[in-house]
């Protein structure tokens, strides 16, 4: 013969654990049912009758089957440095995530509790390390060859013209300028175009360049803010 | 664009029953509260009570438990406010507005009002 | 119920003035659930300030709110012409859900 259903509330058996979805209520010593998430335990059960749940009020939720008396509050509307990659509902918390441009330099177990606004290296400083969900940029002085003219979280160094003749020679801040006599030119993508260079950039290395992140979102522990380096600016 | 818009004024005699509607558009019904506010002429403002249009449940201030009933058709996204019993100390101008869950009960949009006026 | 109590009910100030009205209820409300409504005569309130210091896009930044516990304050920094009207308090912390009493700001 088939196990006779039992309904809850009902006593496990001696030694016995409760089902799926359901608890032991040590008050009234039987296993009654859990309430399911967006919902709570309004009224506990008893011996005679079943759990009584009710959903959860306005900003609180439950994401779990429970047997909560009051749902959990959702966290704070997101600031204005963060983006709401989830809404607050009935079965699930809010998620702010910081927006592009900045990063999280305070995690909390979803989404970000406190954002930063990346780094940003000045002219003559390029992008050593991009900055990711969690971690800020890295700038570095650019090397002989390499210039940086920009203020920016995403700009590496890139190398200086070559001229045949020289006007004004390049540093870490600035291209070279060639003077005008070839009209022959062959540059790498994304260099400033100054007025006729003749050769290409073949015995320099180019750096590879770093993505351009926008900050998503990341549940990863934080990792905290680095200090100042050197050639960064403030913003 | 998020808009409610009420239906217009009603002059009622004491001890008749009212019915004000608030018709919602530009936003989804899910995950959002309706509220009724009422303000007595020169008076401030008084929550009445709110309603849940995706599930009808419904909470009322006490006071006006057996006074008034809220209820809503999300079929044409108006929600209604019924007041029985009218007396004359409900002459009011009466409001519905709407809070998204998840806001902390911020009434983000309000609809034009409806003045009630009870005189026999 | 919580009874949130508005001081001044009423004030007279100039334009340019600071102004600052302060709300407080009868128990603890959480700042999440203290939100600060402008009414002008004749029109439908319009969400001020909410959960305690956040401002709606679209208002200016001369209206501030700040507190906690049982005392709230709303500020407007430099009076304008367009700020004369009654500003209500709200808590949503605790069902009945009230309002203040409202505190009216009035050209001097």
């Known amino acids: 013969l088939p196990a006779q259903v039992a309904f809850t509330p009902y006593a496990p058996e001696p030694g016995g654990t409760c089902r799926l979805r359901e608890y032991y209520d040590q008050t009234a010593q039987m296993c009654c049912s859990k309430c399911p998430p967006g919902q709570h335990a309004k009224v506990f059960c008893t011996k005679t009758s079943d759990t009584v749940c009710d959903s959860c009020e306005d900003s609180t939720y439950t994401q779990l089957w429970n047997w909560v008396p009051e749902c959990l509050s959702c966290g704070s509307r997101c600031s204005s440095d963060q983006v709401e990659t989830q809404a607050c509902t009935r079965e699930q918390n809010r998620i702010c995530t910081c927006r592009p441009g900045w990063y999280c330099a305070l995690s909390k177990q979803e989404g970000c509790r406190l954002c930063a606004q990346l780094r940003k290296c000045r002219p003559g400083f390029g992008v050593a390390r991009p900055g990711t969900e969690t971690s800020d940029v890295v700038c570095k002085p650019c090397a002989p060859g390499t210039f940086s003219n920009t203020t920016s979280s995403t700009d590496i160094c890139r190398p200086h013209q070559i001229c045949h003749v020289v006007a004004i020679p390049g540093n870490a801040s600035m291209d070279a300028v060639c003077t005008s006599t070839s009209p022959t030119r062959s540059m790498a993508p994304g260099a400033v175009h100054l007025p006729q260079p003749v050769s290409t950039r073949s015995q320099h290395t180019q750096p590879t360049p770093a993505p351009s992140t926008a900050p998503g979102t990341s549940f990863l522990l934080p990792v905290g803010p680095s200090p100042p380096a050197e050639g960064s600016t403030g913003d | 664009q998020v808009q409610l818009v009420q239906s217009g004024s009603e002059l009622k005699k004491p001890g008749a029953s009212v019915k004000v509607s608030c018709k919602a558009s530009?936003?989804?019904?899910?995950?959002?509260?309706m509220h009724w506010v009422r303000q007595a002429p020169g008076q401030g403002l008084e929550w009445m009570g709110r309603i849940d249009p995706a599930t009808g449940n419904t909470k009322h201030d006490p006071k006006f438990q057996d006074k008034a009933v809220l209820s809503s058709d999300t079929s044409v996204s108006t929600a209604y406010l019924q007041i029985s019993s009218l007396k004359a100390e409900d002459t009011a101008v009466y409001y519905c507005?709407?809070?998204?869950?998840?806001?902390?009960?911020?009434?983000?949009?309000w609809g034009q009002g409806t003045l009630v006026t009870v005189s026999s | 119920d919580i009874q949130m109590t508005q001081s001044p009910s009423s004030l007279s100030a100039s334009v340019g003035d600071r102004v600052t009205i302060t709300c407080t209820a009868s128990s603890s409300v959480s700042s999440n659930y203290l939100h600060w409504y402008q009414q002008k005569p004749g029109k439908a309130p319009k969400l001020l300030i909410y959960s305690t210091s956040n401002l709606p896009s679209g208002v200016p930044s001369r209206f501030s709110g700040s507190g906690s516990g049982t005392d709230y304050s709303l500020t407007i920094s430099s009076l304008q012409p367009e700020d004369f009207a009654t500003y209500y308090c709200h808590q949503y912390h605790r069902s009945p859900w009230t309002f203040g009493q409202g505190t009216k700001v009035e050209i001097k």
């Open positions: 507005a709407r809070s998204p869950y998840g806001d902390f009960g911020a009434m983000d949009y």
């Open positions: 530009g936003f989804n019904n899910k995950d959002i509260y």
